[in-house]
């Protein structure tokens, strides 16, 4: 083993903060993957690993791509994946993961069931049916289109199974519902069997959610099909078609046939043969939890080891089991010791504004080849062995509840974007005027201007608009906003002034008085829903009970903020609710609450800060 | 012994072209950043470009962008620099650096080999 | 860009003498700084790595010192062949920038 000039944490009860995530795996895997990574080394060494939720922690953890704030880029997929700096002060000791790359648990991409027989286990890559093999979902077996994939190694053995994401599942946002796509659709007068981008000019992939949206305008966009998003070839980021054609044989997954390589591909339109469109399907993609401890190795003092079995080697292989070396457990028992364990002791969360530090870069732990460009090159014709004529039964067909609304055509009653100053960026915005789920879409007020922020993949940003435009009747300049979740209305605050509107009709502007608030109230924050129309309205550190109906607060009610949200600032200047979240921001900064959505129930376990991020680059997923 | 060779350099017209090479030995070039720096008659030292181990990654100076070319053939430990519409401040020395850092671990941070420098002058 | 900037430009000594030479940053790089030595028609040579670290063969007389944005080169006492160009170097973000030098000269 090797030290990094000997610098090590001077104490053993050591805090890490997860300032943001990757897209390739579910949230908590990723917390899990991170906090097994650290009870790798908890196991061998006296130290304890707690999770914080801001910048005072001695390893910050962050996601980030190429050029990511430090002085060291990444380097899109493969090659680095990963650096984190020796222990010390500010960036030090922190560790970057490069989001370029495909995270996994080290076996492909993780793709969440639904219904089926697995209670929501992930889908097992590859899988065995009818004696073949499968790198991704799979239509096989079903004659209603439905791609599924076993959740074990061998259906034919296990038959355990369940539905992968797909629009004939469920649909994500717009306004149908989540109810599944109807196949086929009108559109425009024409007549459409699969999800499209037509009429819509950010590239999201939706369908109708009845036979014709022409007439019924119900809609929802389709779920991302991870496990068949290509990479590579000449189609990169579109998505497999199956069945596809190849050499005049008919393919219902991914295939290595045609490569001398081995590597798995599939077509990206129905007819490889006439279209020649292909990429590479998803790889193993790497270990978050491998690379994560061997990052939190270098975090902890820990340079590379010249051991090829030692975690710390500095090239990437995945494995099974705990992933230590002898190597491995003297070099850290060298820093720190082979005693019994501290014990733990979680700092308090800060309630202070937390200073941003420089995001940290990544280097590599391998150095694997690089993707051809090259098309599949023609191989052997044998086909494929037929298709199986058993498949798994159909769970049921329940939807989850709806997200953000937008219209799927380009064109909207919003006014169309307009020269925005000083910057129509809004990641170059500081702090935001105010915040709020509006239709379930995220709006960005700033300056009388404001951008709709779609949460899903790719360029979910629309906007600017002209905030006037929309509700003719605001000022400039707002404090916050807030959509009444039963009746739609949208209240919004500017000042010791309100305005509801319900759809196009405002009512307003009221003085704050009318809502039973003294001029020592200055200004609104937020609102929270509760249940059985009430909210909480908050100004400067104090929190009311709100009727939404009377539109008066109880003044009785008046309690101070950190009575019932602990841990977050007590001077927030914006305070919304986002996916059953409360959000109170501070600076560039939130603090993120899970909270009981209960009138009159103050539930101190439940109204914890779970998460402290930066709006830009977390709620607004700026680069 | 750590040998950085350049060559390549010479005399060439405004808007011409001409592809800088170094040999590397010594080390296993494989794993290392490789750096051009370069340097104005009587003025400092300016980065230029950057490749990673692989060669799947480059990074350019803003001075450069669009107009030179930084690769590598880790099979003969060479280190190229591609440097087309050449202009008249584009006239220095021009060194090979090797990074100190290896692999993920931030933190040794410098230049510790250096070659020789070669002279490209770009001049009608 | 972060831009660093050396003083003096031009130091004047003798040998035996101590030399300090200093490097600013226009905002917080820790401690990825790194200092260089070039002589006339020579390469330059690292001399110090993460501000306070000697690299390989360099005499004890140089040291390095500092961190966030003010950084110092001492060498304690000067030799004959220290009379050179002095460099600093940052990497704390991107893209690495140089200072533009101090000359130390004999008096």
């Known amino acids: 083993f090797q030290t990094f000039k000997g610098l090590k944490w001077d104490h053993h009860n050591i805090t890490y903060w997860i300032q943001n995530y990757s897209e390739d795996l579910p949230r908590d895997m990723i917390d899990d993957a991170f906090a097994r990574a650290f009870a790798v080394w908890g196991e061998v060494a006296p130290l304890t690993f707690t999770r914080v939720y801001g910048p005072e922690a001695d390893i910050v953890i962050q996601f980030g791509v190429a050029e990511h704030g430090d002085g060291y880029p990444f380097d899109g997929k493969d090659g680095l994946l990963a650096h984190a700096f020796p222990p010390g002060a500010g960036v030090q000791g922190d560790a970057h993961f490069d989001d370029d790359e495909l995270w996994s648990l080290g076996k492909g991409v993780v793709i969440p069931t639904y219904y089926g027989n697995s209670n929501g286990a992930p889908c097992h890559f590859p899988f065995t049916f009818e004696g073949r093999s499968y790198s991704a979902c799979t239509t096989d077996g079903r004659n209603d289109g439905t791609p599924w994939c076993s959740t074990t190694a061998d259906y034919d053995k296990d038959g355990k199974f369940g539905f992968c994401p797909s629009e004939r599942l469920y649909t994500e946002h717009g306004n149908g519902e989540g109810k599944p796509c109807v196949f086929p659709f009108i559109f425009e007068g024409r007549s459409y069997s699969a999800c499209t981008t037509k009429g819509r000019s950010d590239g999201y992939r939706w369908c109708a959610t009845t036979a014709n949206y022409d007439q019924d305008k119900l809609y929802g966009f389709c779920p991302t099909r991870v496990d068949a998003t290509v990479v590579g070839g000449n189609s990169a980021g579109e998505l497999c078609v199956f069945p596809f054609v190849f050499l005049g044989k008919q393919y219902s997954s991914c295939t290595s046939d045609g490569r001398r390589d081995g590597r798995l591909w599939c077509a990206t339109t129905s007819n490889f043969d006439t279209d020649k469109k292909w990429g590479f399907c998803p790889d193993q993609g790497y270990s978050l939890f491998l690379v994560a401890a061997h990052e939190f190795g270098h975090a902890l003092g820990l340079d590379h080891s010249s051991v090829p079995e030692a975690l710390m080697y500095p090239l990437y292989s995945y494995l099974e089991g705990f992933p230590l070396n002898k190597d491995d457990i003297d070099g850290i028992q060298y820093l720190y010791g082979r005693g019994s364990k501290p014990d733990p002791r979680p700092p308090a969360t800060t309630t202070t504004e937390p200073q941003p530090t420089a995001p940290p870069t990544m280097c590599p732990t391998i150095p694997p080849t690089a993707y051809p460009t090259v098309g599949p090159t023609v191989g052997p014709t044998g086909a494929p062995s037929p298709g199986p004529t058993s498949s798994p039964s159909p769970g049921p067909t329940g939807a989850p509840s709806p997200g953000p609304t937008a219209p799927p055509t380009a064109g909207s009653s919003e006014a169309s974007t307009e020269s925005l100053s000083p910057a129509d960026n809004p990641c170059n915005v500081d702090v935001f005027d105010a915040i709020a789920e509006i239709q379930g879409a995220l709006h960005f007020f700033k300056d009388g201007w404001y951008w709709k922020f779609l949460n899903h993949r790719g360029s979910p940003l629309q906007g600017p608009f002209l905030t006037a435009r929309t509700w003719p009747a605001l000022p400039a300049t707002l404090d916050s906003a807030f959509e009444d979740p039963q009746t739609k209305r949208v209240f919004f605050f500017s000042g010791r002034q309100m305005w509801v509107y319900t759809g196009k009709t405002v009512l307003g502007p009221r003085s704050l008085d009318k809502l039973g608030l003294g001029p020592e109230v200055t200004h609104v924050s937020g609102l929270l829903p509760r249940r059985l129309g009430k909210a909480l309205l908050f100004s400067k550190g104090r929190v009311w009970r709100f009727d939404l109906k009377s539109q008066k607060v109880d003044p009785q009610s008046v309690i101070r903020v950190d009575k019932e949200f602990s841990g977050v600032p007590w001077n927030s200047h914006d305070i919304f609710q986002y996916q059953d979240k409360a959000y109170f921001c501070h600076g560039k900064f939130f603090w993120r609450v899970s909270f009981q959505n209960e009138v009159n129930k103050v539930d101190h376990e439940v109204n914890q800060v779970d998460d402290v991020g930066y709006v830009t680059y977390d709620l607004l997923q700026c680069p | 012994e750590v040998q950085l060779l350049e060559s390549g350099g010479g005399l060439v017209q405004p808007g011409g072209s001409l592809r800088l090479s170094c040999a590397a030995s010594g080390f296993t070039f494989s794993v290392y950043d490789m750096w051009w720096v370069r340097q104005a008659p009587g003025k400092g030292l300016e980065w230029v470009s950057v490749i990673y181990p692989s060669g799947g990654a480059t990074y350019y100076a803003d001075s450069v962008k669009g107009r030179f070319t930084i690769s590598r053939d880790n099979s003969k430990n060479t280190l190229y620099l591609q440097m087309n519409s050449l202009r008249a401040e584009d006239t220095a020395v021009y060194y090979c650096a090797k990074d100190r850092a290896y692999g993920d671990y931030v933190g040794w941070n410098g230049f510790d080999y250096w070659g020789q420098g070669t002279l490209v002058t770009v001049s009608s | 860009e972060i831009v660093l900037t050396q003083s003096p430009a031009t130091l004047s000594l003798s040998p035996g003498e101590r030399a300090t030479l200093s490097c600013r940053a226009s905002?917080?790089?820790?401690?990825?700084l790194a200092w260089y030595q070039q002589k006339p028609g020579q390469a330059p040579r690292l001399l110090i790595y993460d501000a306070s670290y000697r690299a390989t063969g360099i005499p004890a007389r140089f040291s390095g010192s500092g961190s966030g944005t003010d950084f110092t080169l001492t060498i304690s006492s000067l030799e004959p062949e220290d009379f050179a160009v002095y460099y600093c170097?940052?990497?704390?973000?991107?893209?690495?920038?140089f200072g533009q030098g101090t000359r130390l000269e004999i008096k």
């Open positions: 170097q940052q990497r704390g973000n991107w893209p690495i920038t």
């Open positions: 905002q917080s790089i820790s401690s990825f």
